[in-house]
């Protein structure tokens, strides 16, 4: 089941999935002046069996000026540098994602890829948040969000992270005004069925990753 929305936006923070659940789709998008080749894949799909997961399909872009010829150019470092995405791009993977069954690692870039990636997440996906440069984190709980199914609808849990400017005087975590959950009531009051595939295993994994997830910043 695809998640209806993108993960929540936190001011001055970005998020990243450390691994992508089977069923996740990634748009095959091309940068300006390029387009997907006519016979090429529309999206990449994380698929697999009990022992191995990988991305099906390859994205290919061609110059908009030419018809259906792929220009095999290795992207220059500065070309890759410009990619921005809601999910943080990291040139090094801080954990061995193959150790998490039913998940794919970050797909490598393709020639003339768009500067942004749009993923279509599935129920059970977890993403991790970090404050952007120049802001520091005030944690009230886990800086992560999970796509859950409740009442037959998908929603993302609210990450317990506030990013404050280094120079700003702000409240300490204990002094925060409580934020309402998306439905306007605490999650614990929700009595209907909650589907959170792999939540436990990912939470445990997150605990071991906490110090290493964001050590490499994409400059």
């Amino acid at each position: 089941e695809l998640c209806d929305d993108d993960p929540p936006e936190i001011p001055h923070a970005t998020f990243k999935a450390m691994a992508y659940k089977e069923g996740t789709m990634l748009n095959c998008e091309c940068k300006r002046g390029f387009r997907r080749i006519k016979s090429g894949s529309l999206y990449m799909l994380c698929t697999g069996n009990s022992s191995h997961s990988s991305w099906d399909n390859q994205c290919q872009c061609t110059s908009s000026a030419t018809r259906n010829t792929t220009k095999q150019v290795t992207p220059q470092p500065e070309e890759q540098k410009e990619r921005k995405t809601t999910e943080m791009q990291s040139p090094m993977q801080p954990v061995d994602q193959a150790s998490l069954p039913g998940h794919c690692r970050e797909p490598p870039p393709w020639e003339n890829e768009a500067t942004e990636r749009i993923y279509h997440f599935v129920v059970g996906q977890m993403v991790y948040y970090q404050c952007v440069q120049g802001y520091r984190a005030l944690h009230r709980g886990p800086a992560e969000s999970v796509c859950k199914m409740t009442h037959g609808k998908t929603r993302w849990t609210q990450p317990q992270l506030i990013c404050t400017g280094e120079m700003e005087t702000s409240q300490f975590p204990g002094e925060e005004k409580p934020q309402a959950s998306p439905e306007g009531r605490p999650e614990s009051e929700t009595s209907c069925l909650v589907t959170t595939t792999d939540f436990q295993i990912q939470t445990e994994m997150a605990a071991t990753m906490e110090t290493s997830i964001f050590t490499t910043e994409y400059q």
Epitope: Y43, Y119, H120
Partner: nanobody, 123 residues
Framework: QVQLVESGGGLVQTGDSLRLSCAAS????????LAWYRQAPGKEREFLAA???????LYADSVEGRFTISRDNPKNTVHLQMDSLKPEDTAVYYC?????????????????WGQGTQVTVSS
């Protein structure tokens, strides 16, 4: 509540052009494709074109080269520029929004529909 409202339909002559618009509201459409379909009398609803948030496009063979889909994200609108129209293009044209990447979604599986706008091409 998601709403898709089409406009721009009408009666034109063979060879003329027409530009349809669709205003989408009620949610963020970042991870949705916006698409156009049409339904001629007595026929099934037919996929025409789709576009992603980042302007990745897909066209049905029947309209590629004649129709152009475009998207204005800040305004949450999608347009369909139709050139060199033919009498067989006569149909009700529907705007659609669907979760996921650009792909020719079968009509029964589409998440949201507009109410449609009539396009008639006379010879």
């Amino acid at each position: 509540q998601v709403q898709l409202v089409e406009s721009g339909g009408g009666l034109v002559q063979t060879g003329d052009s027409l530009r349809l618009s669709c205003a989408a509201s009620g949610r963020s459409f970042r991870n949705y494709i916006l698409a156009w379909y049409r339904q001629a009398p007595g026929k099934e609803r037919e996929f025409l074109a789709a576009i992603s948030w980042l302007d990745g496009t897909l066209y049905a063979d029947s309209v590629e080269g004649r129709f152009t889909i475009s998207r204005d994200n800040p305004k949450n609108t999608v347009h369909l520029q139709m050139d060199s129209l033919k009498p067989e293009d006569t149909a009700v044209y529907y705007c659609a929004a669907d979760r996921g990447p650009v792909r020719p979604v079968l009509a029964p599986d589409v998440d949201y529909w507009g109410q449609g706008t009539q396009v008639t091409v006379s010879s």
